[in-house]
């Protein structure tokens, strides 16, 4: 039975040009994370296994750094950038485990003043 | 220019072990993963297991575990694929590949190996 | 394990024509798909990298497409050199598996 919850940075926003780090924590389960996948819509930006180490795709890998932890750092952030983020945690022997992020990422100017989080 | 020069042909009984090297040159050794991979006759491509040199750690596939060792040697580039307790399903062209986010860039030429009695 | 089932197993095409060779694999596995060329007495040769991406050097009537379980290699223009069998495989997850192959003869 699949007892593990994954807690999420939820949504958050950035800065276009500026960098953001996605997290993702796994709790309530002792299964043992074999490999976390960080994907994209319908990419996958990142590896990290327990045994191997970090392996970033090579389409990202100018733009993608490894961590914190199991999490990812996204730099140069582009409004393309906005969109649903996946972490997907493989555990043995529980199984699979995702967590979504919602990235966006505001003008320089729009970050700035926060205008776009008053309240009226 | 990136190679991999993998040691010759070898004939083994059942039961004996087989140790295969794969040589790498042309490129940082411990920047890429050396990974292992087999073809026996008019089967498909089988991953068997896989080192990163630079930390040792390993992954196998789990019909191999206990009966392959795959190990790697920073000081001369070369990994090394030990398979055990051989029988004549392990008969075979045994690939060593460099890994690149988990494909495989280039090939080193194939080790046959036969296991007969 | 993630199973990767390749159709056809064997495809017959006139030269200069189109070839197509499909890869579904029995789970998600977002881009994560590699696609090779093998000939007999040679190595494999890398191809098609993240579904989509061509390798160094391929030449560009090789294509792939496709993401999740459903993947695509496209041979636009068939050349005598391209007879060979060609696999996919997921670097999705581990263990790392291959398709069956595809046999690509010319008609």
């Known amino acids: 039975m699949m007892t593990g919850t994954i807690e999420t940075t939820g949504n958050i926003s950035a800065e276009k040009g500026g960098s953001i780090i996605l997290q993702c924590h796994l709790s309530s389960t002792t299964a043992q994370v074999t490999q976390v996948n960080w994907e994209q819509q319908d990419q996958l930006l990142a590896i990290c296994n327990a045994d191997l180490g970090w392996h970033i795709s090579p389409s990202f890998k100018d733009r993608v750094a490894p961590g914190p932890g199991l999490g990812l750092t996204l730099q140069s952030l582009t409004v393309n950038d906005t969109g649903e983020y996946f972490c997907i945690y493989h555990t043995y022997p529980d199984g699979t485990y995702t967590g979504r992020i919602f990235l966006e990422v505001l003008e320089s100017s729009v970050a700035e003043h926060g205008a776009r989080f008053q309240i009226p | 220019e990136v190679q991999l020069v993998q040691s010759g042909a070898e004939v083994k009984k059942p039961g004996a072990s087989v140790k295969v090297s794969c040589k790498a040159s042309?490129?940082?050794?411990?920047?890429?993963?050396i990974e292992w991979v087999r073809q026996a006759p008019g089967q498909r491509l089988e991953w068997m297991g896989v080192?990163?040199?630079?930390?040792?750690?390993?992954n196998y596939k789990e019909k191999f575990k206990g009966r392959v060792t795959i190990t790697a040697d920073k000081s001369s580039s070369t990994a090394y694929m030990e398979l055990s307790s051989l029988r004549s399903e392990d008969t075979a062209v045994y690939y060593c590949?460099?890994?690149?986010?988990?494909?495989?860039?280039?090939w080193g030429q194939g080790t046959t190996v036969t296991v007969s009695s | 394990d993630i199973v990767m089932t390749q159709s056809p197993d064997s495809l017959a095409v006139s030269l200069g024509e189109r070839a197509t060779i499909n890869c579904k694999a029995s789970q998600h596995v977002s881009d994560g798909v590699a696609w090779y060329q093998h000939k007999p007495g040679q190595s494999p040769k890398l191809l098609i990298y993240s579904a989509s991406y061509r390798y160094t050097g391929v030449p560009d009537r090789f294509s792939g497409s496709g993401s999740g379980t459903d993947f695509t290699l496209t041979i636009s223009s068939l050349q005598a050199e391209d007879v060979a069998v060609y696999y996919c495989q997921q670097h999705y997850n581990t263990p790392h598996t291959f398709g069956g192959g595809t046999k690509v003869e010319i008609k």
């Open positions: 042309g490129y940082a050794f411990t920047n890429y993963l």
């Open positions: 590949a460099r890994g690149e986010y988990f494909f495989f860039d280039y």
């Open positions: 080192i990163n040199p630079g930390s040792g750690g390993t």
